[in-house]
């Protein structure tokens, strides 16, 4: 049997050592003990007795099925306990009685049906993070379960086989910063929602089939809910259940962010937020994020005209990887407050983008992200976006563009342009001279000779440049990142010619460790201030005898350099 490995600070690693019991020889010097991925099965009352100063105990996936009642009695200093993914079919309050310093407790993934006969946590007054439940057997949440807990930073409950929720079970916790609920269906959602309304700031609902969700008024008095963010991950919705969910918003007037991640909409977007009060109550929602929305019948999807008014005050919208091919002109015109729009990984082409960015579209828009769509013409794209009078930042990276023409038109306020991973081989004057930030990384550029008088930041890593670009092209440059090119050298004169340069990242290039380069690096200890990735990323490519050496360590041959 292998033994533990401990470092000088008392951090001991015993992961995956085939232990069949808690190893002997534990001492008070131990601060952290990780015995995950073993076959321990049983923890006896004396097994951890010596670990009086232990602060972290991780026993994840160790097949534990029995823990003696007083097994943790000496662990008064323990702050972090992970018992997840074991075989504990019942939980005992006696385990946790002595753990008054505990801040983090993970009991998830054990096959218990309830949290025990009596309250488990009354003594855990310092607890900040609690993870409980499992996918298959945890079936009941009761009023006694959370007694003694008044405030938590994170509470995660995996109740994917929930059969019973006792009303007011979660109400005793007065403040929960982030509650994650894994529920397979919406059966108890309204009851739970009523109980957490006055305590939860961020509610995350996972893997919930909401297709049958139906709203009914909550049995709550006038409540000022602190909830700011609501996220649905892996959920299933229909047009009808979306309408029903909207009715919950009347109870969370401070909500500012809504997120749908990896959800399925079994519908056509035929939303009908019938109640006019819903519209006014969406007033504080500023951020809507949708990622990987699966709509089986996306080709029949409606124009969303029924929700135009809902979104008039929203400032930030992300709809990523969701087969978006058009934002109808009239919808764009209704998004009057929109400042940030991210449509990455969709199906946008110039023809439909023209309709989306019609006259009067997105009048407040400052940032537009169209990364990884199906745009082909840089010239057309720039022309189409001329309607966006306030646009300062455009990301059209990861589109495969035709060769760049000599001239293009762009929104006049544009200051940031991302053209990374677009396959460009040559940069031309199509790129606007107004830019302050330009990203052309991960392309096929072997030179860069474009004058950009206002450019402050240039990102040109992962190209084929053999030298640093000429400093006279960028009189006010502050930052240049030119990693992973074919740069073979740089000199005092080169670096000195960038009058304002504060940050240069030029590592992972093919440096020829000549006498000049090595003597320059030896004579210039201040390089570390400007080269942020110095010294580890600066390696000699040649001559052969110095290959792989750091420039900082490489020493030129006296013979070679003094001929």
């Amino acid at each position: 049997q292998e033994s533990l490995s401990c470092d000088a600070s008392g951090v001991c690693d015993g992961r995956s050592r085939s232990f069949t019991s808690i190893p002997s020889g534990l001492t008070a010097a131990m601060k952290s003990l990780d015995l995950s991925f073993n076959k321990i099965t049983y923890i006896g009352h004396g097994d951890l007795r010596a670990c009086a100063n232990l602060q972290v105990l991780i026993l994840k996936s160790s097949r534990i099925n029995t823990i003696e009642g007083d097994a943790f009695y000496s662990l008064g200093s323990l702050e972090h306990l992970d018992l997840s993914d074991n075989h504990l079919s019942s939980l005992s309050s006696s385990w946790f009685g002595p753990l008054s310093s505990l801040k983090y407790l993970n009991l998830m993934g054990n096959p218990y049906q309830t949290l025990g006969v009596t309250s488990l946590f009354p003594n855990l007054t310092n607890l900040q993070t609690l993870r409980i439940g499992n996918v298959e057997t945890f079936s009941e949440i009761r009023r006694i379960d959370f007694a003694g807990l008044t405030s938590l930073n994170e509470l995660e409950i995996k109740a994917l086989s929930l059969r019973n929720y006792q009303s007011q079970s979660l109400k005793s916790i007065r403040d929960i910063h982030h509650l994650t609920l894994h529920l397979s269906e919406s059966a108890f959602l309204l009851e739970i929602f009523a109980d957490i309304l006055s305590s939860v700031r961020y509610l995350e609902l996972r893997d919930t089939n909401l297709a049958r969700f139906q709203f009914s008024p909550l049995p709550v008095d006038e409540v000022s809910s602190p909830m700011k963010k609501l996220a649905f991950r892996g959920s299933v919705l229909t047009d009808e259940s979306f309408n029903e969910l909207l009715k919950l918003l009347r109870y969370i007037l401070e909500l500012s962010e809504v997120e749908f991640d990896d959800c399925t909409l079994n519908g056509l977007g035929d939303f009908n937020p019938s109640e006019s009060d819903v519209v006014s109550e969406l007033g504080k929602v500023e951020t809507v994020t949708i990622r990987r929305l699966h709509i089986p019948q996306f080709y029949l999807f409606y124009d969303l005209s029924t929700v135009y008014s809902l979104l008039e005050k929203v400032k930030r919208i992300t709809v990523e990887n969701s087969k978006v091919f058009l934002v109808p002109c009239s919808f764009s015109q209704h998004l009057k407050s929109l400042e940030f729009l991210d449509l990455s990984e969709n199906l946008m082409v110039e023809e439909y983008l023209k309709n989306s960015a019609c006259k009067g579209a997105w009048p407040s828009l400052q940032t537009l992200v169209l990364s990884q769509n199906h745009l082909r013409s840089m010239q057309k794209t720039g022309e189409i976006l001329l309607t966006l009078k306030n646009l300062t930042s455009l990301d059209i990276s990861r589109n495969t563009f035709h060769p760049m023409p000599d001239s293009c038109q762009w929104p006049e306020k544009m200051r940031f342009l991302n053209l990374s991973s677009t396959g460009i081989r040559v940069v031309k004057t199509c790129i606007p001279q107004t830019l302050e930030v330009l990203d052309v990384s991960n392309n096929n550029l072997d030179s860069f000779s474009l004058f950009l008088p206002r450019l402050q930041e240039l990102y040109i890593s992962r190209n084929k440049l053999k030298t640093l670009p000429d400093a006279s092209l960028f009189p006010v440059l502050l930052v240049m990142k030119i990693r992973e090119n074919a740069v073979s050298t740089f000199s005092k004169d080169q670096l000195g010619s960038f009058p304002k340069l504060e940050t240069l990242e030029a590592g992972d290039n093919h440096f020829v460790c000549s006498c000049e380069l090595l003597s320059f690096t030896m004579e210039t200890p201040a390089l570390a201030q400007i080269l942020v990735d110095w010294p580890d990323s600066y390696l000699c490519d040649s001559p052969p005898r110095l290959h792989g050496h750091r420039l900082q360590d490489a020493r030129p041959s006296v013979l070679e350099c003094h001929q």
Partner: nanobody, 124 residues
């Protein structure tokens, strides 16, 4: 009629590996609209949940008895769900069933469609 057909079971020595497959045969079946689970039944025992994967493959869960040894995955283009089983133990001997349903859960009774099962025998 939707048919789920399991394959890949067999006899293996303790410590060995197997990969089970579950293919959905009905073309009209909206494969990526369903969650899939693997459930096993040992002789004389009740059905026991093993693992579940959601529609997109973005969420997976496991019974504590198999976590770290088994991996569930799906290929929506091939209408197939897989269960990669490693470090097999005699206690894993059972008939393994594939099940599909609208709910992401470890409760076997919430699944609408079931396969016929594929037997796995782990000898010591």
């Amino acid at each position: 009629e939707v048919q789920l057909v399991e394959s890949g079971g067999g006899l293996v020595q303790a410590g060995g590996s197997l990969r089970l497959s579950c293919a959905a045969s009905e073309l009209a079946f909206d494969f990526d609209g369903y969650n899939f689970a693997w459930v096993r039944q040992a002789p004389g025992r009740e059905r026991e949940f093993v693992s579940v994967i959601n529609r997109s493959g973005g969420s997976t869960d496991y019974a504590s008895s198999v976590k770290g040894r088994f991996t569930i995955s799906r290929d929506n283009a091939k209408n197939t769900v897989y269960l990669q089983m490693t470090s097999l133990e005699p206690e894993d001997t059972a008939v393994y069933y594939c099940a599909a349903g609208p709910y992401y859960t470890g409760s076997s009774d919430r699944y609408d469609y079931w396969g016929q099962g594929t037997p796995v025998t782990v000898s010591s």
